[in-house]
Amino acid sequence: KNLKSPQKVEVDIIDDNFILRWNRSDESVGNVTFSFDYQKTGMDNWIKLSGCQNITSTKCNFSSLKLNVYEEIKLRIRAEKENTSSWYEVDSFTPFRKAQIGPPEVHLEAEDKAIVIHISPGTKDSVMWALDGLSFTYSLVIWKNSSGVEERIENIYSRHKIYKLSPETTYCLKVKAALLTSWKIGVYSPVHCIKTTVENELPPPENIEVSVQNQNYVLKWDYTYANMTFQVQWLHAFLKRNPGNHLYKWKQIPDCENVKTTQCVFPQNVFQKGIYLLRVQASDGNNTSFWSEEIKFDTEIQAFLLPPVFNIRSLSDSFHIYIGAPKQSGNTPVIQDYPLIYEIIFWENTSNAERKIIEKKTDVTVPNLKPLTVYCVKARAHTMDEKLNKSSVFSDAVCEKTKPGNTSK
């Protein structure tokens, strides 16, 4: 009886694992083996595919074959018993195009209200992704084990910290990789769970902000308790993108080591141009807090994010505020080539009760004012990029009196 060729050959490539699967054409024939040949583009001869010769099952692995993953390859298969079937040719394919990204490795560390997630490519030193190692981004799904309500976090890198969690709570998450340059989305990792710790005695510092004064950076933060010492560390932001490296060499800012105030001042030349992460830790001599949330600090934006300049036109029941570009020394306006949002704070001169307006426009109306009353206004600019989240310092306050009661038109 003539052997029939196998059919429905599927090629599965996940990272550097090359798997072939096929259907037997004739289930009634026993003791049949299968063999594959391959052919590279531009070659006439067929070569035996190592790892896929005389296979008794309907699956084989040819990962050991050292292929150029960007080069097209053709496969053929036949069945063998006493005689052989005709060859069945598989559509040619390029391994890189066909490859899927495998599940990443995930390593979790817990604090009281945060989880640190370290993500590594599933295949170390992968040949398939050798040119794309730094292009991987990851997304994750996280949920409280008790509730199951999922939160998705997109576009993260090989180290990510999730804050504002509950102490003594089990969180579960799964992660997948993506190569956006090649339109590839990977498969999810297994689910990993970790329990946050009991609440720490000392909370971390909060609301860290950087501003520029003269030739210095001023770093400020809030803290719950008095009589503390603080230290500040920095890290190049690009280091979070380094795949497989999970040793982050945070560096001290010398002028911000063991400071006793909730701010420190250090020269701008401490940092070369670039994007950095900053974090602050508190200590009372016996206990130490966990590190604060890490803030992103871009020297380029920080250096030029100056407080806005504005003019006020006073009416009886409102101010019209016109925001202009800030002035450098020499009175030349600064070109801000990134979108800004403006925070305007105003208050009655005789009162401490502040009101706030957030506005994207550069002309703003401050409504509901009393006639013939002195109001003070100050403003600052924020970048609209959530990741950079930079703010200028507030402008100096400008105080103006509203007009008498009949000039609102």
Partner: antibody
Framework: QVQLVQSGAEVVKPGASVKVSCKGS????????MHWVKQAPGQGLEWIGR????????KYAPKFQGRVTITADTSTSTVYLELSSLRSEDTAVYYC???????????WGQGTLVTVSS | DIQLTQSPSFLSASVGDRVTITCKAS??????VVWYQQKPGKAPKLLIY???YRVSGVPSRFSGSGSGTEFTLTISSLQPEDFATYYC?????????FGQGTKLEIK
């Protein structure tokens, strides 16, 4: 493969100094931290300090601050521990260890016995 | 400095026994705890890091757990080669500190 090879045993007099070396191979020491750990005879482990060979930044345990100096020579992939004003309680085995991913001391040298004796 | 207290300091057990060593930290260290095994005349060997992650090549009978201030190392079924001294260490804050050690002896 990763290896840390330390210099040989030393016998030194009280008040003197000693410099122990640790040569790394199979990895680039600039990509890691390098730690030193003390173990007195029959005692437990004590962390002395560490260096970042990339920029020579050091951290020391307060107990050892001032009497020990950790240095690195990246051209020879070697780190050093110098102990000064030696006393009998400095008699111990000194280990170097590599600080790798997740800040873990993952590979250790074979240890160097320093004996302080008159 | 963060103190780590191991208990017991000495432990006698037999091959096949399940043993647990505990390590208590004087303050919350998250999951930043490491376990080492040391045999006489040898350097310490890393077993467990980040409280519960077993190092590649370490037998599955070794496991770690805990977070905050309380951590445990468990050996599910003692083998002859497991008799040694075990140390916990915190890597949450400088200076790094070790527990005083637990010497595991054959009963």
């Amino acid at each position: 493969q990763v290896q840390l090879v330390q210099s040989g045993a030393e016998v030194v007099k009280p008040g003197a100094s000693v410099k122990v070396s640790c040569k790394g191979s199979g990895f680039n020491i600039k990509d890691y931290y390098m730690h030193w750990v003390k173990q007195a005879p029959g005692q437990g482990l004590e962390w002395i300090g560490r260096i970042d060979p990339e920029d020579a930044e050091t951290k020391y345990a307060p107990k050892f601050q001032g009497r020990v100096t950790i240095t690195a020579d990246t051209s020879t992939s070697t780190v050093y521990l110098e102990l000064s004003s030696l006393r009998s309680e400095d008699t111990a085995v000194y280990y170097c260890a590599r600080g790798g991913n997740f800040y873990v001391m993952d590979y250790w040298g074979q240890g160097t016995l320093v004996t302080v004796s008159s | 400095d963060i103190q780590l207290t191991q208990s017991p300091s000495f432990l006698s057990a037999s091959v096949g026994d399940r043993v647990t060593i505990t390590c208590k930290a004087s303050q919350n260290v998250g999951t930043n705890v490491v376990w080492y095994q040391q045999k006489p005349g040898k350097a310490p060997k890393l077993l467990i890091y980040s409280a519960s992650y077993r190092v590649s090549g370490v037998p599955s009978r070794f496991s770690g757990s805990g977070s905050g201030t309380e951590f445990t190392l468990t050996i599910s079924s003692l083998q002859p080669e497991d008799f040694a001294t075990y140390y916990c260490q915190q890597k949450n804050n400088y200076p790094y500190t070790f527990g005083q050690g637990t010497k595991l002896e054959i009963k």
